[in-house]
């Protein structure tokens, strides 16, 4: 995993000016309706503000130098960093007695790398050491990929901090919501 090997603390990240996607235009306010407005939400209060109104899984461009020990690439490489939220919060409040917990209202999606590209870089080393050639794996595109409830934290860690959304307060959705139970509501469904 060359890409993993070079993405270390010694990497110098240089954001490229002008590469960030423009925020979508502000929507006019409508207080009588639930309307999707722009802006993120505080991590512990998923419904205090409206969710972002696009699948804003963004491909942010970063320029960085690749380092390997004391050696550093002659030129910086430009790569993508996957950032953003895949649509609205898919949690619904569920009150039982005095307690309040969240249950899912849709699959959980995360903004993660989709495709990678390999790039050959030349590393320059101090002390007259011969330059080294290395192949690095860089993110080429991002996607909103579904996670299942069976994904564990170790599988999430490579997706970045956005992936490890706390599951605090979440309980499995009641069995009453299974397809068979849903069908009981559906008369003349077939």
């Amino acid at each position: 995993q060359g890409w993993q090997a070079f993405k270390n603390d010694a990497t110098e990240i240089i954001p490229e000016l002008g590469e960030y996607p423009e925020p979508p235009p502000e929507l006019e306010n409508n207080k009588t309706m639930n309307r999707a407005e722009n802006g993120g939400r505080p991590p512990h209060h998923p419904f205090e503000t409206k969710d972002v109104s696009e699948y804003s899984c963004r491909e942010l461009h970063f320029t960085r130098y690749v380092t390997d020990g004391p050696c550093r690439s002659a030129k910086p490489v430009t790569e993508l960093v996957c950032s953003g939220q895949c649509g609205p919060a898919r949690l619904l409040p569920n009150a039982i007695g005095r307690g309040k917990w969240w249950r899912p209202s849709g699959p959980d999606f995360r903004c993660i790398p989709d495709r990678y590209r390999a790039q050959r870089v030349q590393l320059l080393c101090p002390g007259g050491e011969a330059p080294r050639a290395r192949k690095v794996r860089l993110v080429a595109s991002c996607k909103c990929k579904r996670l299942t409830r069976f994904h564990n934290q170790s599988e999430l860690k490579d997706f970045g901090t956005e992936a490890a959304r706390p599951q605090k307060g979440r309980k499995p959705r009641p069995r009453a919501r299974s397809a068979k139970a849903n069908q009981a509501e559906l008369e003349n469904a077939y």
Partner: antibody, heavy 123, light 107 residues
Framework: EVQLVQSGAEVKKPGASVKVSCKAS????????MHWVRQAPGQGLEWMGE????????GYNQKFKGRVTMTTDTSTSTAYMELRSLRSDDTAVYYC????????????????WGQGTTVTVSS | DIQMTQSPSSLSASVGDRVTITCRAS??????LNWYQQKPGKAPKLLIY???RLLSGVPSRFSGSGSGTDFTLTISSLQPEDFATYYC?????????FGGGTKVEIK
């Protein structure tokens, strides 16, 4: 009976906007996200986006970015989809669809659909 | 976006025939595949979810199989009410995408 009842057919001119409504009954409206799917004449199905009725938070297919707005009115259990800057290729039947869930298989699907609203864009 | 390719796009069959429709995803979608039936002038109806789970009330002559990128919908013995268009839909990656449809016509 779980039902989604949509507003009637619309004829619009290019550049105009259309707002389609979808009234839910037979279930707790705020328990399920509402999705919108369209179908051009003789064509397949195209997913447009979804809205969480509790938060009003919506997510849209990037194809419609900047042109679509989904809203809900929980007091009337109604979802709305507004499409702006209409073009002739927006001529389609627009469906609202409820996203159902099977917790055993942790899977989701469109289990209830509205009857569809025909939107014709013509000069 | 994930492309969903259905084949054939149309087929002619007789009552009692065994019919197989295939759906291929451009990327691995695990088992997150649903099948819908649509009749002219009507909304789609869910038949099968999670590749092979039959929705309650759907006749057992319908079955689904597959995993990853290749999926199949089979109607073991075609009935008059089965003449319709069938769509697959992936739920693995946003945006959700549907196949182009397979129209099952009377021979």
């Amino acid at each position: 009976e779980v039902q989604l009842v949509q507003s009637g057919a619309e004829v619009k001119k290019p550049g105009a906007s259309v707002k389609v409504s979808c009234k839910a009954s037979g279930y707790t409206f705020t328990d399920y996200n509402m999705h919108w799917v369209r179908q051009a004449p003789g064509q397949g199905l195209e997913w447009m986006g979804e809205i969480n009725p509790n938060s009003g938070g919506a997510g849209y297919n990037q194809k419609f970015k900047g042109r679509v707005t989904m809203t809900t009115d929980t007091s009337t259990s109604t979802a709305y989809m507004e499409l702006r800057s209409l073009r002739s290729d927006d001529t389609a039947v627009y469906y609202c669809a409820r996203l159902g869930y099977d917790d055993i298989y942790d899977d989701w699907y469109f289990d209830v659909w509205g009857q569809g609203t025909t939107v014709t864009v013509s000069s | 976006d994930i492309q969903m390719t259905q084949s054939p796009s149309s087929l002619s069959a007789s009552v009692g025939d065994r019919v197989t429709i295939t759906c291929r995803a451009s990327q691995d979608i695990s088992n997150y595949l649903n099948w819908y039936q649509q009749k002219p002038g009507k909304a789609p109806k869910l038949l099968i979810y999670h590749t092979s789970r039959l929705l309650s009330g759907v006749p057992s002559r319908f079955s689904g199989s597959g995993s990853g990128t290749d999926f199949t919908l089979t109607i073991s013995s075609l009935q008059p009410e089965d003449f319709a268009t069938y769509y697959c839909q992936q739920g693995d990656t946003l945006p959700y995408t549907f196949g182009g449809g397979t129209k099952v016509e009377i021979k």
